[in-house]
């Protein structure tokens, strides 16, 4: 059967900080999360079966006032759809994707959501990962941060 | 074989001016840009087989300040997905997406991504285009500016 | 045959106002918009056939002075889009996107998309629609507002 | 909306100056790029100068370089023309505009580039 997954953002475990990081706590297995023939494991969901895949992520972040100042007012809000080859140890970004944003302070509350898509071959044992700027300030729910991969077809 | 293209932007031939502009030059075949079953060809995409095709685009805009100054700052950030049958001459726009942003001086970089995406029919020998404002402002990495099909299923 | 739909704003019916509503005019079948083994009604994508599915939406927000003064220059322009079930009624967002704007009266022109996708479980009776805050300032091209679904594998 | 009116305009012999003054009200006058245009009696309106939001780039035609200088005082939200070694041929209407949306300068040598535009001055070259 066609593999396929959609991960949604495990809000417990979500890193803090403003740098550009990994996110490695992902739902796979309650919600709208599900995986079939893809194996999630150390953050990163790994390609059990050769193929072109459709790979997508929609990442959203937001601020309340509530939560205290932001450190800056400008911020980067990006994501990076990573792929790993653990045969060539090297990591490529196959998509990203976000915007530089002026939150002021005149507004008690600031949202902003990136999506990104793309068609790519990957390979058995190959790792896709997602990383962002400004975790702390991702939105939690499993309908704003996720990312997924669905096979499509194989290679000839 | 279910026909796809993945198309990376071709950094070395990026049009100037400023209004809606016409890309012509993308990769099809070195890193993540890649081609089955469809026709790059005078900077549009051909379709060789009837069918339903899922379209996406993605588009990044960036600039920084040793760039030299903007005209403006207040900007149109704008891609356009269009289809152009050739047997009957006629371009329509499938997709649209963007923003006009406020890249203020008072900040060194700015950057902004638009993400398109959509199921439609196309016939043999029709063509899809991507057409931007601004170009000069475009994000040249593979991983940045993009787009792509993949056949879904053959029309009824 | 593989189920799909392709639905684009009827913007001779969208409510005015700028809370959080339920968009239910949709065309299906003139332009780019089409439907196979689906049904529309009541203003909601009904599912026929159980299946993991393909879920997008792409949705444009537009101003023009001409149009009169903004009530107010900081928005919330967002979308969701969700699933009922009519045998347990229940609602849940599968997919939001947006951005808080801030459409300052110094510019004449303020545009803004929202582009979502994502990999769902749809069984059939379950109903697909799609609410936006801020109406009132939907662009209605057809290329510009849009949503659809498409098949991609039966559930195992 | 942007309301643009240009003063300074005259009358001038072959080889004096001018200064044109164009005044900006309404919107944020420095987010804009800024242009001059000119139209000769029986002529197409024509390209003269143009200039970023900031005032640190400037544009101008080919028929005016080292003659004209295009410049803008934010402050003030005003923009200037100072001409000199004027000749017959410089004869003509004088109409600023203000234009955004593009990033690229040169764009703005094209009259679609601007979205507002004043009622112009007369400058009268006499040889």
């Known amino acids: 059967a066609q593999p396929f997954a959609h991960l949604t953002i495990n809000a417990t475990n979500i890193p803090t900080g403003s740098h550009k990081v990994s996110l490695s706590s992902w739902y796979h297995d309650r919600g709208w999360a599900k995986i079939s023939n893809m194996t999630f494991s150390n953050g990163k969901l790994i390609v059990n079966q050769d193929g072109f895949y459709y790979l997508y992520a929609n990442i959203c972040f937001r601020h309340h006032e509530t939560s205290g100042d932001l450190a800056t007012e400008y911020l980067q809000l990006m994501v990076y759809v990573t792929k790993t080859s653990i045969k060539i140890p090297s990591s490529h970004t196959l998509m990203k994707g976000g915007s530089t944003k002026y939150w002021s302070g005149n507004s008690e509350f600031h949202f902003y959501s990136i999506n990104v898509g793309g068609f790519f071959k990957l390979r058995s044992g190959e790792e896709i990962s997602v990383e962002v700027s400004n975790p702390s300030l991702l939105d939690p729910d499993q309908d704003a941060t996720y990312f997924g991969a669905f096979k499509v077809r194989d290679i000839d | 074989a279910q026909p796809f293209a993945h198309l990376t932007i071709n950094a070395t031939n990026i049009p100037t001016g400023s209004h809606k502009v016409s890309l012509s030059s993308w990769y099809h075949d070195r890193g993540w840009a890649k081609i089955s079953n469809m026709t790059f060809s005078n900077g549009k995409l051909i379709v060789n087989q009837d069918g339903f095709y899922y379209l996406y685009a993605n588009i990044c805009f960036r600039h920084h300040e040793t760039s030299g100054d903007l005209a403006t700052e207040y900007l149109q950030l704008m891609v356009y997905v269009t289809k152009t049958s050739i047997k009957i001459p006629s371009s329509h726009t499938l997709m649209k997406g963007g923003s006009t942003k406020y890249w203020s001086g008072n900040s060194e970089f700015h950057f902004y991504s638009i993400n398109v995406g959509g199921f439609f029919k196309l016939r043999s020998g029709e063509e899809i285009s991507v057409e931007v404002s601004n170009p000069s402002l475009l994000d040249p990495d593979q991983d940045a500016t993009y787009f792509g099909a993949f056949k879904v299923r053959d029309i009824d | 045959a593989q189920p799909f739909a392709h639905l684009t704003i009827n913007a001779t019916n969208i409510p005015t106002g700028s809370h959080k509503v339920s968009l239910s005019s949709w065309y299906h079948d003139r332009g780019w918009a089409k439907i196979s083994n689906m049904t529309f009604s009541n203003g909601k994508l009904i599912v026929n056939q159980d299946g993991f599915y393909y879920l997008y939406a792409n949705i444009c927000f537009r101003h023009h002075e001409t149009s009169g003064d903004l009530a107010t220059e900081y928005l919330q322009l967002m979308v969701y889009v969700t699933k009922t079930s009519i045998k347990i009624p229940s609602s849940h967002t599968l997919m939001k996107g947006g951005s808080t704007k801030y459409w300052s009266g110094n510019s004449e022109f303020h545009f803004y998309s929202i582009n979502v996708g994502g990999f769902f479980k749809l069984r059939s009776g379950e109903e697909i629609s799609v609410e936006v805050s801020n109406p009132s300032l939907l662009d209605p091209d057809q290329d510009a507002t849009y949503f659809g679904a498409f098949k991609v594998r039966d559930i195992d | 909306e942007v309301q643009l009116v240009e003063s300074g305009g005259g009358l001038v012999q072959a080889g004096g100056s001018l200064r044109l003054t164009c005044a900006a009200s309404g919107r944020t006058f420095r987010s804009y790029a800024m242009g001059w245009f000119r139209q000769a009696p029986g002529k197409e309106r024509e390209f003269v100068a143009a200039?970023?939001?900031?005032?640190?780039?400037?544009n101008y035609a080919d028929s005016v370089k080292g003659r004209f200088t295009i410049s803008r005082d934010n402050a003030k939200n005003t923009l200037y023309l100072q001409m000199n070694s004027l000749e017959p041929e410089d004869t003509a209407v004088y109409y600023c505009?203000?234009?955004?949306?593009?990033?690229?300068?040169?764009?703005?040598?094209?009259?679609?580039?601007?979205?507002?535009w004043g009622q112009g001055t007369q400058v009268t070259v006499s040889s």
């Open positions: 200039i970023n939001y900031s005032g640190g780039s400037t």
């Open positions: 505009a203000a234009g955004s949306g593009y990033a690229s300068l040169s764009y703005y040598s094209t009259e679609r580039a601007y979205t507002y």
